[in-house]
Amino acid sequence: GELETSDVVTVVLGQDAKLPCFYRGDSGEQVGQVAWARVDAGEGAQELALLHSKYGLHVSPAYEGRVEQPPPPRNPLDGSVLLRNAVQADEGEYECRVSTFPAGSFQARLRLRVLVPPLPSLNPGPALEEGQGLTLAASCTAEGSPAPSVTWDTEVKGTTSSRSFKHSRSAAVTSEFHLVPSRSMNGQPLTCVVSHPGLLQDQRITHILHVSFLAEASVRGLEDQNLWHIGREGAMLKCLSEGQPPPSYNWTRLDGPLPSGVRVDGDTLGFPPLTTEHSGIYVCHVSNEFSSRDSQVTVDVLDPQEDSGKQVDLVSAS
């Protein structure tokens, strides 16, 4: 007869490890006892358990409550045991010694490998602002045994760099994703993907990119100069810009206070029925936490009685 086992048994942390030891014997042969021990190199053998055909299972105090026989159905020549709730410290070499009748004793070794699945964490980098050079967008760290694989899944152009730190029973891998911030990246997902043999599927952590920017400001509403005449109702100026964070708008008149009756509604300046009083230079001031922009326009309200054409100057300043 001969003993059958596995060279390596792999189990995930916290799961039960089946340590196989099966005697393939001839007809009529019987197993009298099976002794299990841990036999790591450089250390003496540490008894795990003894299975005896007459006296049952005896588990050594160090493994009390953790070693069991597998539930039925069981082969009569099977000396396998279950090691409950595997921990990292269980990783190592194990030996089963089988005493059979009438063939004698046999022994076999296996290695138990305990996989420690990673618990990845993603840390965003410093605030991203348009105009910066290559900047850290996020870093992702995962520690496990064996070392996990950390990659990135994104549509955004960037560069990655990884480093690994080895500990006594595990390894930590950190991957960084760098990019040159641009407004087109706003709202784009950046996903850290962690692969590991102890995971049923890859773990993914997604970070949404936020890039601070402020676009140039411009004013709309003066495209048709002939509409700006005395008595016209519903005249308005609208300030155009965009930014992240969303900007706030403020209207002023360069050559004095805003005329009475003029309503400020965020990015829009609304006029009552036009009079010559409304002629002047109006300034839209756009700002967010990142920057500020100005755009000014000259309004010249025409008197329809006069033939002289309306002139409008557009000036934009940052």
């Epitope: 005896h52 049952g56 299972l57 588990v59 069991e68 539930p71 039925p72 069981r74 009569p76 099977d78």
Partner: antibody
Framework: QVQLQESGPGLVKPSETLSLTCTVS????????WSWIRQPPGKGLEWIGY???????NYNPSLKSRVTISVDTSKNQFSLKLSSVTAADTAVYYC????????????WGQGTLVTVSS | DIQLTQSPSFLSASVGDRVTITCRAS??????LAWYQQKPGKAPKLLIY???TLQSGVPSRFSGSGSGTEFTLTISSLQPEDFATYYC?????????FGQGTKVEIK
């Protein structure tokens, strides 16, 4: 020499709970799977369920909703509780041990007759 | 559930006869089958496990064979103490089930 002894009331009223204990002597309860099996008068054998010394159990689905098997390693005993009994539960109840290296009941108690009647 | 059907259900034989009892499983059970002997008023006694392995202390006139769905218990030379009821039992899947029994009586 390991011996098993069933104990408990021989008469149980319908709708009540049947309770039996199996005491293991001459050896340890640890390391084995322990079962309850019953045999109605003049009929065949029916497996009720097993318990491992660590406490894990497996029950016959036909009785699962009514049966509980527990173990007390300090007393070297395991027990059977069968709730809501009827006359159909009248039987000789055996406790038995599963072999350490094989699946078969190598040691049996002598059995105890439980009659369900009002 | 796996059904075990024993045949015959009743058997009449004489001392010294060779007796064969068959146990058929409704589906394959590998070799996870045991045979027991039961005498009136007594608990069953294990004879054979794993279809063909003789339990320690059981006389060698008892033997078992088969695998899959068809199994046999053979008593090579029937002795007076062998008159009893014999049961097969499967351990391949839950619930564990027994055959209905074969009663061996004196002819």
């Amino acid at each position: 020499q390991v011996q098993l002894q069933e104990s408990g009331p021989g008469l149980v009223k319908p709708s009540e709970t049947l309770s039996l204990t199996c005491t293991v002597s001459g050896g340890s309860i640890s390391g084995y799977y322990w079962s309850w099996i019953r045999q109605p008068p003049g009929k065949g054998l029916e497996w009720i369920g097993y318990i491992y010394y660590s406490g894990s159990t497996n029950y016959n689905p036909s009785l699962k909703s009514r049966v509980t098997i527990s173990v007390d390693t300090s007393k070297n005993q395991f027990s059977l509780k069968l709730s809501s009994v009827t006359a159909a539960d009248t039987a000789v109840y055996y406790c038995a041990r599963l072999g350490i290296f094989f699946d078969a009941f190598d040691i049996w108690g002598q059995g105890t007759l439980v009659t369900v009647s009002s | 559930d796996i059904q075990l059907t024993q045949s015959p259900s009743f058997l009449s034989a004489s001392v010294g006869d060779r007796v064969t009892i068959t146990c058929r499983a409704s589906q394959g059970i590998s070799s996870y089958l045991a045979w027991y002997q039961q005498k009136p008023g007594k608990a069953p006694k294990l004879l054979i496990y794993a279809a063909s392995t003789l339990q320690s202390g059981v006389p060698s006139r008892f033997s078992g064979s088969g695998s899959g769905t068809e199994f046999t218990l053979t008593i090579s030379s029937l002795q007076p103490e062998d008159f009893a009821t014999y049961y097969c039992q499967q351990f391949n899947s839950y619930p564990w089930t027994f055959g209905q029994g074969t009663k061996v009586e004196i002819k």
